[in-house]
């Protein structure tokens, strides 16, 4: 559904009629080369045509150059995430140039005005890059623009306007309002850099989507489906903030993209992997845990460059905080018969037992319905590395364990009073690890006992054939 307000302003209104803010003595766009991790340290200000600051502040022409571009601001000052990102970049890439693009005067406006200023800011960045390109040893290929929210589209404009092609743009939850469905040159797009990777953390298909829903990069990653982020619920926010509000929830989810990127910089030994999938529902079903043909990738800074003919939408689950990495498992359960199912979908839980650790009791989310004489696929994920899996406990929740199911049981009883005991037959569970790409088959401990009913459990152990690799390639980063 369309956003509540469409792109405003007209082509003839822009650029050739400077706003008052653009004629002030202090420039509206400043380039702050951060020479220290310390946010209190002033750093150096770069300006086109002035080479002295480059020398004074030891700008490294041959190193990577990061431009961090903030978004719309209600406060008019830099937010904490920016300092964390600067620090993480300095930690990870010690020789790199880290430049903060300060466009606060143009961003601290009505949202619609800030949007109409993005083109001007993008143009300023492009002019800076064009000037740097005139210097010996400076290469656009070493430039990585990192834009958050509205800043992602500013990065898009910069990549659009620059003479040549920047190496990489990372869009951290690019802004949605006034950009959803916009022309390819009026928003971040794959044409804006050699590699454009995007993290979407606050997309909504109902109401106002703060982040853009449509894919705008070479790879578009939707952690937790791109909408509800763990640890950002009203309860979580109320627990950690004295006066938690919906605004804090929005900020938590929108800003999560930045923290996922920071996590990828500082916790490179704990990389998070995303998996290509056509949509969030299919991912939730556990269908999309393949690494064949570039179908999986690290997220954030460690993302492997992929320039597919078509955009690649990727999904993953995460923890509620750093390190965000979880371990994904696809579970294939073949139900070969069931009795008296009635209208109620069973509620299953699994517990995974491994050589390193055991999981908590994990719910199996039934996205549609349990099919009989068919293989049902589920996605489960654990926060800890379980090691090699040894056994699985499958539990069918008894009706009394859930008020909702109790009510459904009661309704079902009214319509079918003599409904005999419900029962399902499962012989084996096939498990595939997303992170290692290894597959394993688990068989019931007792081959004679394959039935499970409400309130009961069934135990599965590794079948004799053990681990199978099936020519699958594992993710690109070696896992510890």
């Amino acid at each position: 559904s369309p956003v509540p307000f469409g792109p405003e302003g007209r082509l003839e209104d822009k650029l050739h009629k400077p706003k008052a803010t653009q004629t002030e003595v202090k420039p509206s766009v400043r380039f702050n080369l951060r020479t220290s991790k310390d946010p209190e340290h002033e750093g150096c200000y770069l300006s086109v045509g002035h080479s002295q600051p480059l020398e004074d502040c030891s700008f490294n022409m041959t190193a990577k150059t990061f431009f961090i571009i903030h978004g719309w601001t209600m406060s008019g000052i830099f937010e904490n995430w920016l300092h964390k990102l600067v620090s993480a970049l300095h930690t990870r890439e010690k020789d790199a140039n880290v430049v903060v693009v300060d466009w606060l005067p143009l961003a601290h406006q009505l949202y619609t005005d800030a949007v109409n200023n993005t083109r001007v800011v993008g143009h300023s960045i492009a002019r800076m890059l064009d000037w740097l390109q005139e210097k010996d040893d400076f290469s656009l290929g070493n430039v990585h623009l990192i834009g958050y929210s509205l800043g992602a589209h500013v990065a898009g404009y910069a990549g659009n306007f620059v003479k040549g092609t920047v190496g990489r743009i990372t869009g951290l939850d690019p802004a949605g309002p006034m950009f959803e469905g916009a022309d390819i040159h009026k928003r971040l797009s794959p044409d804006d850099a050699d590699f454009v990777d995007v993290l979407h953390t606050y997309t909504r298909s109902f109401g106002l989507s703060i982040g853009i829903q449509m894919p705008v990069g070479h790879i578009d990653i939707y952690p937790n489906g791109g909408d509800f982020q763990p640890g950002c619920g009203l309860n979580d926010v109320l627990g950690s903030i004295a006066y938690g509000t919906i605004t804090e929830v929005v900020k938590c989810e929108h800003e999560r993209a930045v923290h996922l990127f920071v996590d990828s910089l500082v916790n490179q030994d704990k990389p998070s992997f995303a998996f290509q999938c056509t949509d969030s529902n299919r991912f939730k079903k556990g269908i999309c845990l393949s690494c064949r043909k570039n179908r999986c990738n690290s997220i954030g800074y460690n993302a492997k460059k992929m320039r597919n003919k078509r955009n690649s939408k990727m999904y993953l689950k995460t923890r509620a905080g750093m390190p965000f990495r979880v371990y994904h498992y696809q579970m294939k359960i073949h139900v070969f018969s069931y009795k008296n199912m009635g209208e109620i979908e069973p509620t299953f839980y699994v517990t995974l037992y491994g050589t390193n650790a055991d999981s908590q009791t994990l719910p199996l989310e039934i996205v549609e319905r349990i099919e009989q004489n068919a293989t049902n696929t589920f996605l489960v994920y654990t926060e800890e590395d379980l090691g090699d899996l040894l056994k699985i406990q499958l539990t069918w929740e008894g009706a009394s364990q859930s008020w909702y199911n109790l009510w459904k049981e009661f309704r079902s009883y009214l319509s079918q009073p003599r409904n005999p005991g419900r029962e399902l037959n499962i012989r084996r569970i096939r498990v595939k690890s997303g992170e290692t790409q290894r597959k394993l088959t688990f068989c019931t401990e007792d081959p004679e006992n394959t039935s499970i009913s409400p309130g009961r459990e069934l135990w599965f152990r590794k079948c004799r054939d053990g681990w199978r690799m099936k020519n699958e390639t594992s993710p690109t980063v070696e896992l510890p």
């Epitope: 082509l11 143009h123 390819i184 078509r310």
Partner: antibody
Framework: QVQLQQSGAELMKPGASVKISCKAT????????IAWVKQRPGHGLEWIGE????????KYNKKFKGKATFTADTSSNTAYMQLSSLTSEDSAVYYC?????????WGQGTSVTVSS | DIVMTQSHKFMSTSVGDRVSITCKAS??????VAWYQQKPGQSPKLLIY???YRFTGVPDRFTGSGAGTEFTFTINSVQAEDLAVYYC?????????FGGGTKLEIK
């Protein structure tokens, strides 16, 4: 107000080349993409490609690569499209259009006729 | 390349009627679709962008809707001056592609 003024009609011989111009006024020429669109009599619209005058970046429809070449002169705010090795298939009206929300504004069109 | 298909080459309507023109994309283009009007002997004009937003100065009888692969352009109360060919175009990715056009004829 935004205006795109295109050069006049051309009658060309097969095998020849033609260069069409599109002069822009009323906006900052260098920072908006100018697209070129072909329309043959009784046919629909066909996107040939586009140019960003300030950086001379170009995008071409695969079908027109080698046939069309875009250039721009920022001092005169004029975009050009050269069509080479003309055949009767190239007989059409060619439009330039400036892109922002979509192809916001169009030139009046330049008719090119290829005939021996 | 993304193929945009306008299933009706011609549509006939009367003044005051409501008419809808459809356009189908061969793959998801989200809401990145524009609609153009080309009157006989004139250049095309942008009417709708981003699937549902009216361009500057476009009368409110013209509306657009749709997302994904199916899009509709509607004229709520057709006027005699609406006699034209209407084109959809996706602006999601390069190469930009147009639909074949729908010629609106007034009875």
């Amino acid at each position: 107000q935004v205006q795109l003024q295109q050069s006049g009609a051309e009658l060309m011989k097969p095998g020849a080349s033609v260069k069409i111009s599109c002069k822009a006024t009323g906006y900052t020429f260098s920072t908006y993409w100018i697209a070129w669109v072909k329309q043959r009599p009784g046919h629909g619209l066909e996107w040939i490609g586009e140019i960003l005058p300030g950086s001379a970046k170009t995008k071409y429809n695969k079908k027109f690569k080698g046939k069309a070449t875009f250039t721009a002169d920022t001092s005169s705010n004029t975009a050009y499209m050269q069509l080479s090795s003309l055949t009767s298939e190239d007989s059409a009206v060619y439009y330039c259009a400036v892109y922002d929300y979509g192809a916001d504004y169009w030139g009046q069109g330049t008719s090119v006729t290829v005939s021996s | 390349d993304i193929v945009m298909t306008q299933s009706h080459k011609f549509m006939s309507t009367s003044v005051g009627d409501r008419v809808s023109i459809t356009c189908k994309a061969s793959q998801d283009v989200y809401t990145a679709v524009a609609w153009y009007q080309q009157k006989p002997g004139q250049s095309p004009k942008l009417l709708i962008y981003s699937a549902s937003y009216r361009f500057t100065g476009v009368p409110d009888r013209f509306t657009g809707s749709g997302a994904g692969t199916e899009f509709t352009f509607t004229i709520n109360s057709v006027q005699a001056e609406d006699l034209a060919v209407y084109y959809c175009q996706q602006h999601y990715s390069i190469p930009r592609t147009f639909g074949g056009g729908t010629k609106l004829e007034i009875k």
